[in-house]
Interface confidence: low
């Protein structure tokens, strides 16, 4: 999906008002220095590409993020403020249904959400400082 046509300011507002708080809730009890940020992005469309990938694509050791509150709100924000985004997500929805039903917070998931927090922060302060 090409995120260049999204309404970035509206997505930023959704992040600041709710998504950021849900990410903090998910990470509660984890030291902010526990994980190093290894994923970055160079501008807002690129950040959204990385955010979508980390939030909705199951990874080894963390298959359940798509059911979390921050993920559902992220999906809603992208669906509302990115033209045509919903149509591209039919396959992703099928993958979500196949994800395990119980919410299991593994260390790998915590690390992934820590990366997401960094990506969202970068989304709000775009421009990668080095490529």
């Amino acid at each position: 999906y090409d995120f260049t046509n999204c309404d970035f300011e509206k997505i930023k507002a959704a992040y600041l008002s709710t998504i950021s708080k849900d990410l903090i809730t998910y990470m509660s009890g984890t030291k902010s220095t526990e994980f190093n940020n290894t994923v970055s992005c160079s501008n807002r469309p690129h950040c959204l590409t990385e955010i979508q990938s980390l939030t909705f694509n199951p990874t080894a050791g963390c298959a359940s993020l798509a059911k979390e509150m921050f993920a559902m709100k992220t999906k809603a924000a992208l669906a509302i403020w990115c033209p045509g985004y919903s149509e591209t997500q039919i396959n992703a929805t099928q993958a979500m249904k196949k994800a395990r039903k119980s919410k299991v917070t593994t260390n790998k998931c915590l690390e992934q959400v820590s990366q997401l927090q960094g990506l969202w922060r970068r989304f709000n302060r775009p421009l990668l400082k080095q490529q």
Epitope: T4, S42, N43, R44, P45, H46, P126, L127, K129, Q131
Partner: antibody
Framework: QVQLQQSGPQLVRPGASVKISCKAS????????MHWVKQRPGQGLEWIGM????????TLIQKFKDKATLTVDKSSSTAYMQLSSPTSEDSAVYYC??????????WGQGTTLTVSS | DIQMTQSPASLSASVGETVTITCRAS??????LAWYQQKQGKSPQLLVY???TLAEGVPSRFSGSVSGTQFSLKINSLQPEDFGSYYC?????????FGGGTKLEIK
């Protein structure tokens, strides 16, 4: 309305340090990055570097690392570029330009620097 | 660093004609490319960003497109005010680089 007002033309002797200013108005200074671009007479555009006014973090391309120093004064919403030990190669028009996503929606009017003995 | 190769370096055309300027990136920069117009003695002005999004106030005769690593700026029905220099610039990540420029002159 958004404006980037640069300092006037400067004539400097080789080796004498020079400082160019870029005063921003009409928007939140710390929200946007400030970039600097060089254009030699009759030539194309060359990216020098950028500064984040919110925390003064700077990035300069290798060839300008020992030449340019970027600073900001948040209280006056002004960005500065200082060029050390200028030579004739530094004679050019220097532009400041603001950006969020890497493209420049507003530019300063340019500052002409002439290095001559 | 990403290199931007712009062509042609110069171009002569008449008012009313359609012209296309191209820019090729040395690697994949997705849609992260901007186009600027610069008149003699003036600052560059943003025309297009994200390869195909028209900047505010830019006439609809300007359009941007992308195919892989090749980007194009098309100007339909040239107007007298369209003559000047045009530059592409990638905005994918540091260091930002510009194409060498295209000088568009009146035939």
């Amino acid at each position: 309305q958004v404006q980037l007002q640069q300092s006037g033309p400067q004539l400097v002797r080789p080796g004498a340090s020079v400082k160019i200013s870029c005063k921003a108005s009409g928007y939140s200074f710390t929200t946007y990055w400030m970039h600097w671009v060089k254009q030699r007479p009759g030539q194309g555009l060359e990216w020098i570097g950028m500064i984040d006014p919110s925390d003064s973090e700077t990035t300069l391309i290798q060839k300008f690392k020992d030449k340019a120093t970027l600073t900001v004064d948040k209280s006056s919403s002004t960005a500065y570029m200082q060029l050390s030990s200028p030579t004739s190669e530094d004679s050019a028009v220097y532009y400041c330009a603001r950006t969020l996503d890497g493209y420049y929606d507003y530019w300063g009017q340019g500052t002409t620097l002439t290095v001559s003995s | 660093d990403i290199q931007m190769t712009q062509s042609p370096a110069s171009l002569s055309a008449s008012v009313g004609e359609t012209v296309t300027i191209t820019c090729r990136a040395s690697e994949n920069i997705y849609s992260y490319l901007a186009w600027y117009q610069q008149k003699q003695g003036k600052s560059p002005q943003l025309l297009v960003y994200f390869a195909k999004t028209l900047a505010e106030g830019v006439p609809s005769r300007f359009s941007g497109s992308v195919s892989g690593t090749q980007f194009s700026l098309k100007i339909n029905s040239l107007q007298p005010e369209d003559f000047g220099s045009y530059y592409c610039q990638h905005h994918y990540g540091t260091p930002w680089t510009f194409g060498g420029g295209t000088k568009l002159e009146i035939k």
